[in-house]
Amino acid sequence: CDLPQTHSLGNRRALILLAQMGRISHFSCLKDRYDFGFPQEVFDGNQFQKAQAISAFHEMIQQTFNLFSTKDSSAAWDETLLDKFYIELFQQLNDLEACVTQEVGVEEIALMNEDSILAVRKYFQRITLYLMGKKYSPCAWEVVRAEIMRSFSFSTNLQKGLRRKD
């Protein structure tokens, strides 16, 4: 499956929206930095099959959607930007779902990509626990926003790589 160019553009738009969502100076949040242990190896295109990488992207976007759909998130961010962000994520989920089912049969996906999906879920679990521990403070959200931007950037680069391999 050739990931459509629109998906890459959507990813870029999502990144721009995330960048625009910032509300406070990043400089005041340095002490809240945290190692979430981004599962970089899951997205390593050389080590894993394309279908696995795509399903890991899918899980990451799904988890991002879940994270930013909470009431705590709604209170933290601008509603208009958040709505636009949801739309981008939803579109990307649709693109990736079509891609995954085209790569392998639906019934094989769950088994084949269980480890990578679990790694992504654990990563987001750490993010959620961090936010809870920080009582969803503005700085905690800033740190999480920066982290999600980094993981999105990473997956965007890998998607470019996957398209090139085709």
């Epitope: 910032g22 990043h26 400089f27 340095l30 930095r33 920066a146 982290e147």
Partner: antibody
Framework: EVQLVQSGAEVKKPGESLKISCKGS????????IGWVRQMPGKGLEWMGI????????RYSPSFQGQVTISADKSISTAYLQWSSLKASDTAMYYC??????????????WGQGTLVTVSS | DIQMTQSPSSLSASVGDRVTITCRAS??????LNWYQQKPGKAPKLLIY???SLQSGVPSRFSGSGSGTDFTLTISSLQPEDFATYYC?????????FGQGTKVEIK
């Protein structure tokens, strides 16, 4: 390959203005902050200030506040350090270095080669 | 501002020696501490970040430890290329501040 390339050495007279540059390549320039560090001859490292190129938000060390201006042009992936009126005591090597911002990653992992500024009448 | 104090300011050692440099912060900085190596005429090089994480490409003879206010950089077996000046730097709050440096010289 990640690189920070600084502009060349400068020889200036007291009272003159100067703007030195630091061009980033091989990475997303707006995803990292750029810090500036001064090293006077035979002395240690002094942290001057930092800029977030994504929005040009800047912070200075109290020792350098009002003495220098840090800026960035994200369209050409370049950060700047400037003086409006140089003093002999500004003679030093100036380094730029990148910082991962709020992300958990190595701080100041890449440095420019340094720009030697000599101020003498 | 957070003050960073390194000790000793200089030391003489031989190849193969175990070398320890300490850094003390004027207030707790958790584990937000970096160590740099600088050779004459060169830009500083990051060795250790977050108190104990070894930067990619740095030999494993370098290690860092500590948290709160007291930190240590250890070179387990000094090599000829390790003769340089070492700086600690706090990274928890602006302005970031460096220690005054420790010069490691050949005995």
């Amino acid at each position: 390959e990640v690189q920070l390339v600084q502009s060349g050495a400068e020889v200036k007279k007291p009272g003159e203005s100067l703007k030195i540059s630091c061009k980033g390549s091989g990475y997303s320039f707006t995803s990292y902050w750029i810090g500036w560090v001064r090293q006077m001859p035979g002395k240690g490292l002094e942290w001057m200030g930092i800029i977030d190129p994504s929005d040009s938000d800047t912070r200075y060390s109290p020792s350098f506040q009002g003495q220098v201006t840090i800026s960035a042009d994200k369209s050409i992936s370049t950060a700047y350090l400037q003086w409006s009126s140089l003093k002999a005591s500004d003679t030093a090597m100036y380094y730029c270095a990148r910082h991962p911002g709020l992300n958990w990653a190595p701080d100041f992992d890449y440095w420019g080669q340094g720009t030697l500024v000599t101020v003498s009448s | 501002d957070i003050q960073m104090t390194q000790s000793p300011s200089s030391l003489s050692a031989s190849v193969g020696d175990r070398v320890t440099i300490t850094c003390r912060a004027s207030q707790s900085i958790n584990r937000f501490l970096n160590w740099y190596q600088q050779k004459p005429g060169k830009a500083p090089k990051l060795l250790i970040y977050a108190a104990s994480s070894l930067q990619s490409g740095v030999p494993s003879r370098f290690s860092g430890s500590g948290s709160g206010t007291d930190f240590t950089l250890t070179i387990s077996s000094l090599q000829p290329e390790d003769f340089a000046t070492y700086y600690c730097q706090q990274a928890i709050d602006l302005p970031f501040t460096f220690g005054q440096g420790t010069k490691v010289e050949i005995k």
